[in-house]
Interface confidence: low
């Protein structure tokens, strides 16, 4: 019967002679050279050669366990004289023994990962892994231990798992956003003489809302003409926020001040500016300066950072209303309505007009009155300027026939003495009435109660 032990062969042999594997031997072999040993199977005659007389097997080439860990061969023992086998052909195995000839290799040369800024110490960031081609079942050649070569004190790595975690409290993206961590994987359980590989992990801190908005100045001043219609933008204010994205979004609001109901603030979503706009009609003569308290706040707040203080800031906005030169107008109404008797005489005073100018009278207002040019010629009435900011409407003829013309519309131009001259046109409605002999009105046409502006023929 065959006599042999398991054959083992160390990989990566560097000696100059062939590497001795072992000896095939039959108990029928009397040592007289009558038996011939023959080898067949994986690598026989090429990788493995046999001394046909002694059964000694040698390896002719350097073998790599990671390429092929096991060779299966067959042995025969032949009687040289008869040519017949003295043993049944038998299969045997040459097992290649591992040496530590492979360094750990990471699955990626570069890893990228993100972790929120201000994370608690020990927050999971990323897991790296390295594989070692050596034999994991024998020795520590494939036992990989991870360590951090670059990236402390910010990050740590678990030696067995390759899990990278945060190692420093209050890592602030606004201070530093990018970290390059270098991780080493070393075999032999990290012991001296182990082989190693490294990988780079690019870690980005992602933003959390840990910064409130801040106005760069405590007071802003804008001016706007009193004629600005509602909706007019009069100025922009901008708070800055060190965060990014939705954490840097800002909402503006007016929280206090005399102008609370006179102005609005809207948020420009693109620029994150607050636009102060006119809400109600302004009047320089009533109020010239408004003070507002404007607040900038983050709409999305993380409760865990509220201890840092309120996520809002406020600034004072001073708005100066600018005067616009306004024309004089009738004092008591947009139009005057007056009456004339059918039997009136010429040059009778039927109405006194009063005018006012909203502008501040720096040197006293002086108004002049006249009929509009289109009504002045051939009019049935005249206007008499009293030079005291009043004027009288006078009849120009004897008698009026209310059946011919029941209502007259007089366009009166009132001008001031400013430079440039400002003027407005007011309408005086004159209704013709039947009167008794004392001049008391008895009847007037009702349609005169509603009258258009403009000019009726014959005025």
């Amino acid at each position: 019967s065959w006599m042999w032990n398991q054959f083992f062969l160390l990989e990566e042999y560097t000696g100059s002679d062939y590497q001795y594997v072992g000896k095939l031997h039959s108990d029928q072999d009397r040592g007289d050279g009558s038996l011939k040993y023959i080898l067949s199977g994986d690598g026989a005659g090429d990788l493995f050669i046999i001394n046909e007389n002694t059964g000694d097997i040698q390896a002719t080439k350097r073998l790599d366990r990671e390429e092929k860990p096991v060779y299966i061969l067959r042995a025969q023992a032949i009687n040289r004289r008869t040519g017949r086998p003295v043993e049944p052909e038998s299969e045997f195995i040459i097992k290649i023994h591992d040496i530590n000839d492979n360094e750990p290799i990471f699955t990626k040369e570069v890893y990228t990962a993100t972790v929120p800024e201000m994370s608690d110490v020990g927050t999971f960031v990323v897991q790296v892994t390295a594989t070692d081609a050596d034999d994991p079942t024998y020795g520590n050649s494939a036992k990989v231990v991870y360590s951090i070569l670059q990236g402390q004190p910010y990050f740590s790595v678990e030696s067995e798992t390759g899990i990278i975690k945060t190692a420093l409290l209050n890592m602030d993206r606004e201070n530093r956003e990018q970290y390059q961590v270098v991780i080493q994987a070393k075999d032999m359980g990290g012991q001296m003489g182990g082989l190693s590989g490294t990988t780079t992990v690019n870690i980005t801190l992602t933003d959390v809302n840990d910064n409130p908005p801040r106005f760069p100045q405590s007071t802003y001043q804008f001016k706007t003409p009193e004629s600005s219609p509602p909706g007019t933008p009069i100025g922009r204010i901008k708070a800055s926020d060190a965060d990014v994205g939705e954490n840097a979004e800002i909402e503006y609001s007016i929280t206090d001040g005399e102008g609370l109901d006179m102005f609005d603030v809207i948020t420009d979503q693109e620029t994150q500016e607050g636009i102060i706009t006119v809400k109600k009609l302004l009047d320089f003569e009533k109020k010239k300066v408004y003070t507002l308290k404007v607040e900038a706040s983050n709409p999305y707040v993380e409760p865990r950072f509220l201890y840092l203080g309120p996520f809002k800031d406020s600034a004072t906005v001073r708005i100066v209303v600018e005067d616009v030169d306004e024309p004089p107008v009738f004092e008591f109404a947009e139009f005057y309505e007056t009456f004339v008797c059918e039997k009136a005489k010429a040059d009778q005073l039927i109405q006194t007009l009063h005018a006012v100018d909203k502008d501040d009278p720096y040197s006293g207002h002086q108004f002049s009155f006249s009929l509009a040019p289109e009504a002045a010629s051939g009019s049935n009435f005249t206007i008499q300027d009293n030079k005291d900011n009043t004027a009288g409407i006078l009849t120009r003829k004897n008698g009026y026939n209310r059946h011919e013309m029941s209502t007259y519309l007089l366009p009166v131009v009132i001008s001031d003495n400013d430079y440039p001259v400002q003027s407005s046109t007011g309408t005086v409605t004159v209704r013709v009435c039947a009167c008794d002999h004392h001049g008391n009105m008895q009847s007037c046409h009702a349609e005169a109660l509603i009258h258009p502006t403009g000019l009726s023929t014959g005025a």
């Epitope: 993100t114 929120p116 897991q127 790296v128 892994t129 994205g245």
Partner: antibody, heavy 122, light 106 residues
């Protein structure tokens, strides 16, 4: 070859508990996150939680907090998901899924179990 | 929590068609997005991760693109075995899936 083999279908009454197992092979069990995801009939996928078998750390979806418990037995490379106080809306296929190496917080899922149908009915 | 919105919810297409499915995140998730394919009665299968990296063994007719909050899965030439439901999934903050897009035969 990575394989995740789950336990068979279960029928439970409302108020009862169910424990689904997921046996892993073909990789080092302790070195990957194991996630549980469920899918109600004709519906989308809903993440339930994970366990890191290396140290037993877990994280659960707030929706299931207090009702779900994920455990792992390192000696048999098996992960378990137990859901208690069952109600009819818990009728679903429950999957275990391996979280890959790398990526933020365990990343995406590269291998999935075949799924376990849990029917909750009175 | 981050919400994922997939569109369309279903589509009909023929073999050889180019098919595009979109997925929108409710906030910036950078490139932390995966796409899965699921056939009836089966577990989901990973197609694409990190928004545009093809999983080993997945045919090159599948591709992913996008970053931030808008992502796209494209099948360049639909094959008979591609009729299935497709899900997107974010893994930037927690894990959330889109509601799925069913690709049916026209």
């Amino acid at each position: 070859e990575v394989q995740l083999v789950q336990s068979g279908a279960e029928v439970k009454k409302p108020g009862a508990s169910v424990k689904v197992s997921c046996k892993a092979s073909g990789y080092t069990f302790t070195r990957n996150f194991m996630h549980w995801v469920r899918q109600a009939p004709g519906q989308g996928l809903e993440w339930m939680g994970w366990i890191y078998p290396g140290d037993g750390e877990t994280e659960y979806n707030q929706k299931f907090q207090g009702r779900v418990t994920i455990t792992a037995d390192r000696s048999t490379s098996t992960a378990y998901m137990e859901l208690s106080s069952l109600r009819s809306e818990d009728t679903a296929v429950y999957f275990c899924a391996r979280g890959v190496y790398g990526g933020f917080a365990g990343g995406y899922f590269d291998f999935w179990g075949q799924g376990t149908l849990v029917t909750v009915s009175s | 929590d981050i919400q994922m919105t997939q569109s369309p919810s279903s589509l009909s297409a023929s073999v050889g068609d180019r098919v595009t499915i979109t997925c929108k995140a409710s906030q910036n998730i950078y490139k932390n997005l995966a796409w899965y394919q699921q056939k009836p009665g089966k577990a989901p299968k990973l197609l694409i991760y990190d928004a545009n990296t093809l999983q080993t063994g997945v045919p090159s007719r599948f591709s992913g693109s996008g970053s931030g909050s808008d992502f796209t899965l494209t099948i360049s030439s639909l094959q008979p075995e591609d009729f299935a439901t497709y899900f997107c999934q974010q893994y930037y903050s927690g894990w959330a899936f889109g509601q799925g897009t069913k690709v049916e035969i026209k």
